[in-house]
Interface confidence: low
Amino acid sequence: QGHLVHMTVVSGSNVTLNISESLPENYKQLTWFYTFDQKIVEWDSRKSKYFESKFKGRVRLDPQSGALYISKVQKEDNSTYIMRVLKKTGNEQEWKIKLQVLDPVPKPVIKIEKIEDMDDNCYLKLSCVIPGESVNYTWYGDKRPFPKELQNSVLETTLMPHNYSRCYTCQVSNSVSSKNGTVCLSPPCTLARS
């Protein structure tokens, strides 16, 4: 009973929840649940019954494969979906799919926290601002990635003349999307444009 599959999809997309193996032959009943006890749809005696739920009108069952099609998924659809199959023998078998729905990340805004000449070098502190999202950050200087230590929302670095980059890019990403924001400097150490 340890079948658990993880799926991550972008909000607004159409999703197919299915299992990677064949259904048991001549099963008696197939039911999809949202969480552990909320029925979405049940197939029994060559007929599908759709239950009153937030999915009504958004789901379709393919009894041949057991696949459940959900249209226009939203973050509120995040859950573990369970497909339970009742075999002719009377035994039950279940499969679980953990669905994570993520919004596309918004375009980040780079905020210049601090920029100053220091010991003939350029001290730079930039923050990459996006509204309350759990994302990964990657910073680039003239399209070259900064080392991994710098991969959070704030870039703090001291640039020597041989290390100057003109433009700094913050790339925010989650597992379904990615967006960039860029700020450019005029050597040695002044803001040029966004």
């Epitope: 001290y123 991994k148 640039l159």
Partner: antibody
Framework: EVQLLESGGGLVHPGGSLRLSCAAS????????MSWVRQAPGKGLEWVSL????????YYADSVKGRFTIFRDNSKNTLYLQMISLRAEDSAVYYC???????????WGQGTLVTVSS | EIVLTQSPGTLSLSPGERVTLSCRAS???????LAWYQQKPGQAPRLLIY???SRATGIPDRFSGSGSGTDFTLTISRLEPEDFAMYYC?????????FGQGTKVEIK
């Protein structure tokens, strides 16, 4: 001229604690990330910890995570490494080093020896 | 983490000879983020090369670095007496920062 001077090393029993200091001069200390790197006797170099210029971000090698704390006092131009639950394998010369653009280490202090032994 | 393997472990040479030290990475080092350090007994390491091939300030031009990806080389064109020391490579393209185990260049 950039100078880094470590202190605070010594002999400590397993399970004990020690605090290392690194006094910096010759540059605007608060503008640079700093790091600790160690070298066990007769062995190679191992990166230990990093702190950003403002002190807001810290990073640790897995081997010291949860036992070592890096911090800095920019008003005193001093970097620190607080070490607890010391083990024999922590015995090493500990160097503080200025991070150049979060890339390589340049320059390094002369090092301070930490010996963990019963 | 990226493992750096230096070879040979020890080199026994005479002043005036040309030296080639190798540093091989277990995976590609991004943007040639590789540095070389020299360390003499009882002293701290000193930066020689950064970015695989750029000489640090004050480093004589007999020291040169080359390579990219997984294979890097430090060359000393003509050994001077003060060059007998340990040499370490270090990658700074991915976390954690890692060093090679070192190559000892000793007088024959």
């Amino acid at each position: 001229e950039v100078q880094l001077l470590e202190s605070g090393g010594g002999l400590v029993h397993p399970g004990g604690s020690l605090r290392l200091s690194c006094a910096a001069s010759g540059f605007t200390f608060g503008g640079y990330a700093m790091s600790w790197v160690r070298q066990a006797p007769g062995k190679g170099l191992e990166w230990v910890s990093l702190i950003s210029g403002s002190g807001g971000s810290t990073y640790y090698a897995d081997s010291v995570k949860g036992r070592f704390t890096i911090f800095r006092d920019n008003s005193k131009n001093t970097l620190y490494l607080q070490m607890i639950s010391l083990r024999a394998e922590d015995s090493a010369v500990y160097y503080c080093a200025k991070y150049s653009n979060y890339d390589y280490f340049d320059p390094w202090g002369q090092g301070t020896l930490v010996t963990v032994s019963s | 983490e990226i493992v750096l393997t230096q070879s040979p472990g020890t080199l026994s040479l005479s002043p005036g000879e040309r030296v080639t030290l190798s540093c091989r990475a277990s995976q590609s080092v991004s943007s040639s983020y590789l540095a070389w350090y020299q360390q003499k007994p009882g002293q701290a390491p000193r930066l020689l090369i950064y970015g695989a091939s750029s000489r640090a300030t004050g480093i004589p031009d007999r020291f040169s670095g080359s390579g990219s990806g997984t294979d890097f080389t430090l060359t000393i064109s003509r050994l001077e007496p003060e060059d007998f020391a340990m040499y370490y490579c270090q990658q700074y393209g991915s976390s954690p920062r890692t060093f090679g185990q070192g190559t000892k260049v000793e007088i024959k």
